[in-house]
Interface confidence: low
């Protein structure tokens, strides 16, 4: 199927930007990794490049504004031709979720008391109003609470006395047209308008004052302009050549609004001064090799020594990377290939052992299954042997770092009737549901 | 606007019941807690009991407790107050009233009369043997 083709992907906010057209397939689209592509306009954007995992989302509004609920935050696989950590497809969301509370208590209403006296007409003569009010303290609310409907009402009241009604101006009409539009015929233009004394008209009976100043006003229509005449187009120029050495690229042809030139106030020519076209090189660009993460370092072992478990002798180990999706004559992988560091292997050793403190609460599980819980635990932490931290292998060559490797075998009193680990889990509260962020927009 | 009307009041003997009920008019009904209090004659207006908006609390005042049960109907807008083991002391007009609700609860909050928007014109409870 066709797709939208755009020149960038923005790795912060997962958008699609310059884009380069439409009616391309994706293949051709992402002959050139560093574009990206939508399948509609406003769809999910969808890097060229290896899929991998996107950031975390930030944590999503606490599903309820006081007490204890949930949150959630999600990440989206996405690139082409490929999947992320895990085997998962582009464009699969992954989610998690954690407790929250943005306020301890919830708020209490309150309730009013009983309404004050009215206060006097807010006006001397004619109609006015006046007001009363009442507390919200039958009872006080609680944690930012309030009571429900006004603190105050007001009414019509009457003073029984006529108000004098003083002349004023309604807005001046509007100016008259001139006699012609564009200066040079034979007669001289003018412009009226006039205003109304009605915005209000005096009263009579008590006597208001008149409106000061003239019913009508004149002048002459001044800086009229010679006529206008209107802009045209001239042919298009020559097609620009591919800009690119690979993959799509755009060329542009140009025109100028001189056929003819607009005079005296005329409109510029409409439409469009450039346009563009999509060129294919029909070649792929080049693609850099990227580092896959590190192996697991080899067993610690010694040279001509069958095992130096639970010993206080240094041996070495290794661990390996590949160099993956070079293509099309890209970059190599810098940096080494394998690393080697020396170390004591504590494998399988008896070690006695000290019970952590409690660790933070984990994440929610599962984030959009039924009754997610969360844990936390203590662990039989290893007792590590105070072997040297460093040592010198060969004469001349200075110090090197010794690292423990191996899994031990820590021995600890039982807590709770567990040797290794103790767990505790709680469930999540006000969990809310997860959905698709892109499809919540439509 | 909600205007409330109760009835079912009426003259019984004491460990008799009677049933109560306040219908409301307006589409806003399920959004209100609503509440029934009662005056005795000569007496101050005292709280019953009272039911939030979903139904899913309800509070009743120590003197009933046991006695009298308050339910709700959303979709018929109809609040009921199911009256056993009627006592001489019961003896009062019984008035239905609509508070605001939301995330508002408990016992304090709706037997203050002032939080109370909407009332009813009363039915009158007489239990005499």
């Known amino acids: 199927d066709p797709v939208l083709c755009f020149t960038q992907y923005e790795e912060s906010s997962g958008k699609c930007k310059g884009l380069l057209g439409g009616g391309v397939s994706v293949e051709d689209c992402c002959l050139n990794t560093a574009f990206a592509y939508q399948k509609r306009s406003g769809g999910l954007c969808q890097p060229c490049r290896s899929p991998r995992w996107s950031l975390w989302s930030t944590w999503a509004p606490c599903s309820v504004t006081c007490s204890e609920g949930s949150q959630l935050r999600y990440r989206r696989c996405v690139g082409w031709n490929g999947q992320c950590s895990g085997k998962v497809a582009p464009g699969t969301l992954e989610w998690q979720l954690q407790a929250c509370e943005d306020q301890q208590c919830c708020p209490e209403m309150g309730g009013w008391s009983g309404w004050g006296p009215w206060e006097p007409c807010s006006v001397t003569c004619s109609k006015g109003t006046r007001t009363r009010r009442r507390a919200c303290n039958h009872p006080a609310p609680k944690c930012g609470g309030h009571c429900p409907g006004q603190a105050q009402e007001s009414e019509a009241c009457d003073t029984q006395q006529v108000c004098p009604t003083h002349g004023a101006w309604a807005t001046w009409g509007p100016w008259t047209p001139c006699s012609a539009s564009c200066h040079g015929g034979p007669h001289e233009p003018k412009e009226t308008r006039s205003r109304k004394c009605s915005a209000p008209e005096p009263s009579q009976k008590p006597p208001g004052k008149p409106c000061p100043g003239l019913a009508y006003e004149q002048r002459r229509c001044t800086g009229l302009p010679p006529c206008p005449v209107a802009g045209g187009w001239g042919p298009w120029g020559p097609v620009s050549p591919c800009p690119v050495t690979c993959g799509l690229g755009q060329t542009m042809e140009q025109r100028t609004c001189n056929h003819p030139v607009p005079q005296h106030g005329g409109p510029f020519c409409a439409g469009d001064a450039t346009r563009t076209h999509i060129c294919n090189t029909a070649v792929p660009c080049p693609v850099d090799g990227e580092w896959d993460s590190w192996g697991e370092w080899s067993p610690c072992i010694r040279r001509n020594m069958k095992s130096i478990s639970c010993q206080e002798i240094p041996g070495q180990q290794s661990r390996g990377r590949t160099c993956r999706g070079r293509k099309f004559d890209g970059h190599r992988c810098a940096g080494q290939q394998q690393d080697i560091r020396h170390c004591y292997s504590i494998q399988h050793c008896p070690l006695k052992g000290s019970w952590s403190e409690w660790s933070t609460w984990g994440l929610c599980m599962p984030p959009c299954g039924p009754n997610p819980t969360r844990a936390r635990q203590r662990l039989c932490t290893p007792l590590l042997p105070k072997y040297p931290p460093t040592v010198s292998m060969v004469e001349g060559q200075g110090e090197k770092n010794v690292t423990f490797w191996g899994r031990p075998l820590p021995r600890c009193e039982e807590l709770q009737g567990q040797k290794l680990v103790v767990e505790e889990k709680r469930p999540c509260l006000h969990v809310p549901a997860c959905k698709d962020p892109e499809e919540e927009e439509l | 606007q909600v205007q409330l009307v109760e009835s079912g009041g009426g003259l019984v003997q004491p460990g008799g019941s009677l049933s109560l009920s306040c219908a409301a008019s307006?589409?806003?009904?399920?959004?209100?807690?609503m509440g029934w209090f009662r005056q005795a004659p000569g007496k101050e207006r005292e709280w019953v009991a009272a039911?939030?908006?979903?139904?899913?609390?309800?509070y009743y005042a120590d003197s009933i407790k046991g006695r009298f049960t308050l339910s709700r109907d959303n979709a018929e807008n109809t609040v009921w107050l199911q009256l056993n083991s009627l006592k001489p002391e019961d003896t009062a007009v019984y008035y239905c009233?609509?508070?605001?609700?939301?995330?508002?609860?408990?016992?304090?909050?709706?037997?203050?009369?002032?939080?109370?928007?909407?009332w009813g014109q009363g039915t009158l409870v007489t239990v005499s043997g």
């Open positions: 307006g589409r806003t009904f399920s959004s209100y807690a």
């Open positions: 009233a609509a508070a605001e609700s939301g995330r508002y609860s408990g016992r304090a909050y709706y037997s203050a009369p002032g939080v109370y928007l909407y």
């Open positions: 039911i939030t908006w979903s139904g899913a609390n309800i």
